[in-house]
């Protein structure tokens, strides 16, 4: 049995997959900050997790996905206020009893040191220094991401 949060996540991901392919993103749009091969947008207002997920979707983006601890640290370096929390694209899947990214993959237990409980209706937020489990209904800020298309240099055969 999927929770309402899981259904919302699946529905939005499916609708994103149905949309027509768009040309690759070479530069970050206005207001988005480049972090390596991603563009990040930090919200100013607050929302529960599912509304944050939906807002990113309307901007043709997703809630932030963090590949590893190194990417977490670099993202946290952009958060200069210790008191601010941001939703990312990770929530607890009751059916699989595990933390699940909105792209369908599961959290590698070594990637993030989560403070708080892993239980139903729990979603993950990050601050400047830590990673927290919060009730998904909590209203905090959020981070959207867009992937930049890597620019591949053309290789010409020797003449």
């Amino acid at each position: 049995q999927k929770s309402s949060i899981e259904k919302c996540s699946v529905d939005i991901q499916q609708s994103r997959n149905k949309t027509t392919e768009r040309p690759g993103l070479l530069n970050c749009p206005i207001y988005w900050q480049q972090l390596r091969e991603k563009c990040l947008l930090f919200s100013h207002t607050v929302n529960p997790w599912n509304n944050s997920l939906a807002d990113c979707s309307t901007k043709e983006s997703s809630l932030l996905l963090i590949r590893d601890k190194d990417e977490l640290i670099h993202t946290q370096n952009l958060i200069r206020d210790k008191a601010i929390l941001f939703w990312i694209g990770l929530n607890f899947s009751l059916s699989e009893k595990n933390w699940k990214w909105i792209n369908g993959s599961f959290l590698n237990s070594n990637d993030l040191e989560i403070r708080g409980d892993a239980k139903e209706n729990s979603c993950i937020s990050i601050s400047q220094t830590s990673v927290y489990s919060e009730y998904c209904s909590t209203e905090i800020r959020w981070i959207c991401q867009k992937e930049l298309t890597p620019v591949r240099n053309k290789v010409y055969p020797d003449s």
Epitope: P29, I30, Y31, Q33, H44, T45, L78, I79
Partner: antibody, heavy 118, light 108 residues
Framework: QVQLQESGPGLVKPSETLSLTCTVS????????WSWIRQPPGKGLEWIGY???????NYNPSLKSRVTISVDTSKNQFSLKLSSVTAADTAVYYC????????????WGQGTLVTVSS | EIVLTQSPGTLSLSPGERATLSCRAS???????LAWYQQKPGQAPRLLIY???SRATGIPDRFSGSGSGTDFTLTISRLEPEDFAVYFC?????????FGQGTKVEIK
């Protein structure tokens, strides 16, 4: 209620640097984009650039080589420096709050006229 | 950069009449990120409409925005005496954000 107040000299000599500060009250600067816009007398509006509280900036390409915007979160202020000014830089300079792709320039300072003249 | 062209340059109308202001973009405005501002002499601009059709906080419902792509319209359903001012459109979907040259709504 968020309020913005520009301050700085009203007269700058040609080739010198124009320096303005915007003080934000009624809200924290640790969010939003903080923008500068100018309006030459009797003319339209021109966006100069913005800064995010973490130091991320974006400038109008037409002014980029001469513009620096900085932020001081401890004082709830952000500043504009425009170097090598000419008479064409004479304008009313406004600071404003910008919520980016959510809501654009929703709070403005009252503006300050800067005249470039020797 | 995106060039915004507003028309007409001046609109002469009487209180109670309907005002229709046009803003045309040189290329499509991303996600309808288009705003309208009102400016009175000696004052800073005031945000009226954002996202092409959403009214900003505290803006009366006689102001409405519409359009997408390259063509946008600001409509004032019944002009009040305080509505006579200059109106600017702005796109904020592409860098740099740009403004139209303005439409002056004056009393006939």
């Amino acid at each position: 209620q968020v309020q913005l107040q520009e301050s700085g000299p009203g007269l700058v000599k040609p080739s010198e640097t124009l320096s303005l500060t915007c003080t934000v009250s009624g809200g924290s600067i640790s969010s939003y984009f903080w923008s500068w816009i100018r309006q030459p007398p009797g003319k339209g509006l021109e966006w100069i650039g913005y800064i995010y509280y973490n130091g991320h900036t974006n400038y109008n390409p037409s002014l980029k080589s001469r513009v620096t915007i900085s932020v001081d979160t401890s004082k709830n202020q952000f500043s504009l420096k425009l170097s090598s000014v000419t008479a064409a830089d004479t304008a009313v300079y406004y600071c404003a709050r910008d919520s980016g792709p959510w809501v654009p320039l929703d709070y403005w300072g009252q503006g300050t006229l800067v005249t470039v003249s020797s | 950069e995106i060039v915004l062209t507003q028309s007409p340059g001046t609109l002469s109308l009487s209180p109670g009449e309907r005002a229709t202001l046009s803003c045309r973009a040189s290329q499509s405005v991303i996600s309808s990120y288009l705003a309208w501002y009102q400016q009175k002499p000696g004052q800073a601009p005031r945000l009226l409409i954002y996202g092409a059709s959403s009214r900003a906080t505290g803006i009366p419902d006689r102001f409405s925005g519409s359009g997408s792509g390259t063509d946008f319209t600001l409509t004032i359903s019944r002009l009040e005496p305080e509505d006579f001012a200059v109106y600017f459109c702005q796109q904020y979907g592409s860098s740099p954000p740009t403004f139209g040259q303005g439409t002056k709504v004056e009393i006939k």
